[in-house]
């Protein structure tokens, strides 16, 4: 028997957040915050002995949750 169609959302795509579009989802504290409380990290200088800089879709710093801790800047998707 054939399977039904796959979900339209890719397996690795971020799930919709409970935030209204005016806010962003802080993955660390797992709730919505003003987007200005999330901070995009500055890439490390070239040649620095560290992993590649994180992209905007990967965990990044959150001023609201304490600098250096993980957060995802997911604008509200309602």
């Amino acid at each position: 028997m054939r399977r039904g169609p796959r979900s339209l959302r890719g397996r690795d795509a971020p799930a919709p957040t409970p935030c209204v579009p005016a806010e962003c989802f802080d993955l660390l504290v797992r709730h919505c915050v003003a987007c200005g409380l999330l901070r995009t990290p500055r890439p490390k200088p070239a040649g620095a002995s560290s992993p590649a800089p994180r992209t905007a879709l990967q965990p990044q710093e959150s001023v609201g949750a304490g600098a250096g801790e993980a957060a995802l800047p997911l604008p509200g998707l309602l």
């Epitope: 209204v20 579009p21 005016a22 806010e23 962003c24 919505c32 003003a34 200005g36 800047p73 309602l78």
Partner: antibody, heavy 118, light 113 residues
Amino acid sequence: EVKLVESGGGLVQPGDSLSLSCAASGFTVTDYYMNWVRQPPGKALEWLGFIRNKANGYTTEYSASVKGRFTISRDISQTIVYLQMNALRAEDSATYFCTSYKNAMDYWGQGTSVTVSS
Amino acid sequence: DIVMSQSPSSLAVSVGEKVTMSCKSSQSLLYSGNQKNYLAWYQQKPGQSPKLLIYWASTRESGVPDRFTGSGSGTDFTLTISSVKAEDLAVYYCQQYYTYPLTFGAGTKLELK
């Protein structure tokens, strides 16, 4: 038709408490956060705070000017939002608006007037 | 707190004229995660409650006439009315929702010459 209707305003004395209500209809209230904003006569708008939706556990944010004195809450049906104001001061005299909050402050009520005077 | 500064505070115009008003924020309202500016414009007519005109600095709210245009990025924003109508006479407020507390400008009052 979208409707936000505030009520509960009036004349009170300094130090008194007052509770304002905002009844919402005509849109999916559960999708929205709800704000309270005030406007003293002839002056600019001031944001007081908001309450998030059910999906966010009705969490709140407040302006420093009212934090600890004012409390925003929602009823179980989510269609009514309250602003509980304690220890009122003369400078709290204003028209109080409730607004929905999604892309910005999308819908506004007509406002209810609060006068704090002895 | 982010301070929103609007200029001019009042503006005398004739019907049919093009009008621009300015809003400046004390810090950038551009969120690099989505390249959106967290700025809105509202119109408040005498004796009425405010009405949302523009959000994300340049997105017109549904039902708002296309003579209203929002532009700008970062800290400098402009609301333009391409051809003023008598019904546009009002106070216009900008507001940031980039961070708490949400803050409004003092408004620009549009009056008839």
